[in-house]
Interface confidence: low
Amino acid sequence: EAHKSEIAHRYNDLGEQHFKGLVLIAFSQYLQKCSYDEHAKLVQEVTDFAKTCVADESAANCDKSLHTLFGDKLCAIPNLRENYGELADCCTKQEPERNECFLQHKDDNPSLPPFERPEAEAMCTSFKENPTTFMGHYLHEVARRHPYFYAPELLYYAEQYNEILTQCCAEADKESCLTPKLDGVKEKALVSSVRQRMKCSSMQKFGERAFKAWAVARLSQTFPNADFAEITKLATDLTKVNKECCHGDLLECADDRAELAKYMCENQATISSKLQTCCDKPLLKKAHCLSEVEHDTMPADLPAIAADFVEDQEVCKNYAEAKDVFLGTFLYEYSRRHPDYSVSLLLRLAKKYEATLEKCCAEANPPACYGTVLAEFQPLVEEPKNLVKTNCDLYEKLGEYGFQNAILVRYTQKAPQVSTPTLVEAARNLGRVGTKCCTLPEDQRLPCVEDYLSAILNRVCLLHEKTPVSEHVTKCCSGSLVERRPCFSALTVDETYVPKEFKAETFTFHSDICTLPEKEKQIKKQTALAELVKHKPKATAEQLKTVMDDFAQFLDTCCKAADKDTCFSTEGPNLVTRCKDALA
């Protein structure tokens, strides 16, 4: 229904705390360089204004759209052009073009320092002094580094953060209580970020239809007892929620997500028998829980898929009469039978089925033509299954760090023109798939591996779009989202690449590496590994292993030496010489 004042409506629906959190996230995602204090001031002004509209919906400006109100606030910021350059040009436009312009200027890789966690005592002190400000800082710092983070989910992670601090700051050993718990939240939040970015990419590049197809497949896997009409309703609602969040309409997004959670809990009987535990929780936890709820038990009596989609005499007639609905029912029926497949694979199968019907229904004898379609799925299914087996075997043999290094070598050979920091970040993220997925039961591995890899490769594509340097990467990133992962997997050594000349300074290290945390040490070593491959793209695995073992030995020796600086300055050049010889 239409409301006289949109801002009053959202304030009433969401409540002050969530309203303020979401406005802070919105501003931080649009203007990523502003300080917390600058944004907090704007948030307070917007909240005060919303309260006047709640008191009197007819008050001045209360009837304006949220984009107009928020955009006007952002455009009133002093020194906008000095700090944000051409983003300031957005302010010369009218809505809705102004908001579109802001969206286009979101930076997926802002030049901000890494979000460092203060030490436990300091963190607890500032949390106890002012929990609201502390959580505000958290929302601001995460949102500006992840401009497409799913806003209602970020409120959930902030709530988790709050609960952990409340518990651990009361303990004697705060550090050992906080570290593992906060590490866990950070890991989950980072995965959530890349997954949501993938959804927004799908929406931005291929539109709502593509996202809705993704949602139908995902929901059908999770809720195999729900009928097609129910799945379609949920997919439509979920598409709306995600469209709003990806479009910066965070208040509407959070409000509609809460509505969807409410609907699911009130209609459990027609959706799934697994929802009750989620539905007993408060709002943020409930919506989060529903988003990752376990798959319902598959109905025992499902007929073979061939009956309706291959053997039925009316296949071409049904397809011609309502293409999207018929393909939707195919995707629904196939997905509910295959919780063990990735969504990407299910969408590739649906695409193959569509292409087959397009071709065959125009022929003289369609059934003879499309009769083998299910058999033609086989290679499409085998390819990701082999990928999972090969990579999980390798992960089990090498462990996470070794597996990351294997991927780093592989991807540097595929796209040596890509910057080393991007390659290292991608390989580290891709390598985490082992820890995340290879330990799962067999039937959960494939969906976990492929859908996670797809999300990470989406980030590679986004970073590459800013500065395109590799034709290989451009080729894989230009196709459809579901074809990206197979495209990257199929890439081989880039034969067009002219190897980098050997620069001794790239492989020169100093004693400061010894005091770095383990993660930072790994990144330094992986940077050197990528540079080695760029120097010798056709180096064998053996050669690279020899060099990296030598390098690890060198670091170990010099970091244990009494005079570290002397060790690094004398042994370093020897290492460089040995490396050159080993790779000659």
Epitope: C265, Q268, L275, Q276
Partner: nanobody
Framework: QVQLQESGGGLVQPGGSLTLSCAAS????????MSWVRQAPGKGPEWVSA????????RYADSVKGRFTISRDNAKKTLYLQMNSLKPEDTAVYYC????????GSQGTQVTVSS
């Protein structure tokens, strides 16, 4: 279409007994936990009792503990509430719900305890 149909209510004297039934259709009854909820005149809904999908785990509000017994027959797709030692404050419309929901999806059955 999910349907829940309660029956068995009526007028009973304090200390008396009644057994309510709830016939379910339109969903896989045996997969869901169920509850009984009641609403007294002028008051909000109050959760009374719950039972898990298999019937093994039962829960009761403090106000009815020891007097009411919830049970189910999955083959008949029916939920029951055996009410003993009824008190005037048990007067309400009783309805069954899926899970622990207290939102009404049916008409309910009136129980009046009065002398």
């Amino acid at each position: 279409q999910v349907q829940l149909q309660e029956s068995g209510g009526g007028l009973v004297q304090p200390g008396g007994s009644l057994t309510l039934s709830c016939a379910a259709s339109g969903f896989t009854f045996g997969s869901f936990g169920m509850s009984w909820v009641r609403q007294a005149p002028g008051k909000g809904p109050e959760w009374v009792s719950a039972i898990d999908s298999s019937g093994a785990d039962t829960r009761y509000a403090d106000s009815v503990k020891g007097r009411f017994t919830i049970s189910r027959d999955n083959a008949k797709k029916t939920l029951y509430l055996q009410m003993n030692s009824l008190k005037p404050e048990d007067t309400a419309v009783y309805y069954c719900t899926i899970g622990r929901s207290t939102s009404r999806g049916s008409q309910g059955t009136q129980v009046t305890v009065s002398s």
